[in-house]
């Protein structure tokens, strides 16, 4: 004969477990039902009566089948430097992200608690690491025959063009000067073309998601903390 | 609740070596952990630091260099290939935990790290 | 190091006498920084974090003020347990430490 179903809230077998999208309350010291996302328990279940839920307010949410008393706070608003990625729902958090031109600068759990503006190489220097969502742009000093005369947050150093008579020698901030017969371009060392966009190996060695959550506090100011500070702006 | 380093000792040049950070009393699965060093007579210096969901970040200058993995009471450092520039006592600490910044609050006493050939 | 530029490299002060350390950030850090006191043989002890909140067990003392790229480290009726030296840490995720104050307690 098949085992009679068991209606919550109900004693488990001695050393059993409850089942799925149930728990065990102390208290009661019966099997009783979560809450499904977007609601929580608003009374707890006894030895006679079940759990009873009840929606989450607003600006609060649940994600997860639960039995908590309150619904936890979505997270503050995006900051005007960030972008609202997900709305806060009653079974989801806020998502904000850094915006284009920023990264996160600090998170030690999913959420973003500090976006920083991208570090912008000065003159003379290029991008030897572009910037991801969490992690800066790196500079490096352009290599004999190679030059980058802008500030910027994505371009390489360049390789000088060749002349066949050099009117202005170029260096590490500027091109090359040909007198008037056409110039060719060299493939001096160091020049690499990484090509757009780039995906190169960033400061994590796991994939961290594009959206973070929205922290209770949201700091936003531009900040470079990447060590090679030589070739970058703001010093 | 305590932090230990271990497997310090002399190596030669290019011979990898594994630092062990081993913690009790402390669940890493809520806590974020680091490594730092620090050469005789110089400042501390960090090396990287591990997330609780696994993600780890390195100092520009170690990527590559070092590695940092978990098990449920370690945390260990490898030197992929040590030169006598990472003479140094190796640390290992617990960050403060929750969401802000990057605290440490509990280290171990350290482990001297030796590379010469 | 980081971009952490830590003064004075040394300082020594009377006992009862007050010390002021200061640290400076390459580029804004908003509050995101700890103070570390560490002395021969042993690891360093947290102190300060997000600028001026004391960590747990440490003496009222000890005070930290600043926000963006200036810090300041206030250690004021000093004592001989005082005599250490003193770390400014940058708490977002690329960590960076100054280059140490060295307190001499006479």
């Known amino acids: 004969l098949p085992a009679q179903v068991a209606f919550t809230p109900y004693a488990p077998e001695p050393g059993g477990t409850c089942r799925l999208r149930e728990y065990y309350d102390q208290t009661a010291q019966m099997c009783c039902s979560k809450c499904p996302p977007g609601q929580h328990a608003k009374v707890f279940c006894t030895k006679t009566s079940d759990t009873v839920c009840d929606s989450c307010e607003d600006s609060t949410y649940t994600q997860l089948w639960n039995w908590v008393p309150e619904c936890l706070s979505c997270g503050s608003r995006c900051s005007s430097d960030q972008v609202e990625t997900q709305a806060c729902t009653r079974e989801q958090n806020r998502i904000c992200t850094c915006r284009p031109g920023w990264y996160c600068a600090l998170s030690k759990q999913e959420g973003c608690r500090l976006c920083a503006q991208l570090r912008k190489c000065r003159p003379g220097f290029g991008v030897a690491r572009p910037g991801t969502e969490t992690s800066d742009v790196v500079c490096k000093p352009c290599a004999p025959g190679t030059f980058s005369n802008t500030t910027s947050s994505t371009d390489i150093c360049r390789p000088h063009q060749i002349c066949h008579v050099v009117a202005i020698p170029g260096n590490a901030s500027m091109d090359a000067v040909c007198t008037s017969t056409s110039p060719t371009r060299s493939m001096a060392p160091g020049a690499v073309h990484l090509p757009q966009p780039v995906s190169t190996r960033s400061q994590h060695t796991q994939p961290t998601p594009a959206p973070s959550t929205a922290p209770g506090t949201s700091f936003l100011l531009p900040v470079g903390p990447s060590p090679p500070a030589e070739g970058s702006t703001g010093d | 609740q305590s932090v230990e380093e271990s497997g310090g000792r002399l190596v030669t040049p290019g011979t990898p070596l594994i630092l062990t950070c081993t913690v009790s009393?402390?669940?890493?699965?809520?806590?974020?952990m680091g490594w730092f060093r620090q050469a005789p007579g110089e400042g501390l210096e960090w090396i990287g630091s591990?997330?609780?969901?696994?993600i780890t970040y390195y100092a520009n200058w170690a990527e590559g260099r070092f590695t940092i993995s978990r098990t449920s009471t370690t945390v260990d450092l490898e030197i992929t290939s040590p030169t006598t520039e990472d003479t140094a006592t190796y640390f290992c600490?617990?960050?403060?935990?929750?969401?802000?910044?990057?605290?440490?609050?509990?280290w171990g006493p350290g482990t001297l790290v030796t590379v010469s050939s | 190091a980081g971009d952490m530029t830590q003064t004075p490299a040394s300082v020594e002060v009377a006992v009862g006498g007050t010390v002021t350390i200061k640290c400076q950030a390459s580029?804004?850090?908003?509050?995101?920084l700890a103070w570390y006191q560490q002395k021969p043989g042993q690891p360093p002890k947290l102190l300060i974090y997000?600028?001026?909140k004391l960590a747990s067990g440490v003496p009222s003392r000890f005070s930290g003020s600043g926000s963006g790229t200036e810090f300041t480290l206030t250690i004021s009726d000093l004592e001989c347990a005082d005599a250490a030296t003193y770390y400014c840490?940058?708490?977002?995720?690329?960590?960076?430490f100054g280059g140490g104050t060295e307190v001499v307690v006479k």
């Open positions: 580029q804004s850090i908003n509050i995101y």
């Open positions: 009393g402390i669940d890493l699965s809520n806590y974020a």
């Open positions: 591990r997330r609780t969901d696994g």
């Open positions: 840490q940058q708490g977002i995720n690329n960590i960076g």
């Open positions: 600490g617990r960050d403060v935990g929750g969401d802000g910044g990057w605290y440490f609050n509990l």
């Open positions: 997000d600028a001026s």
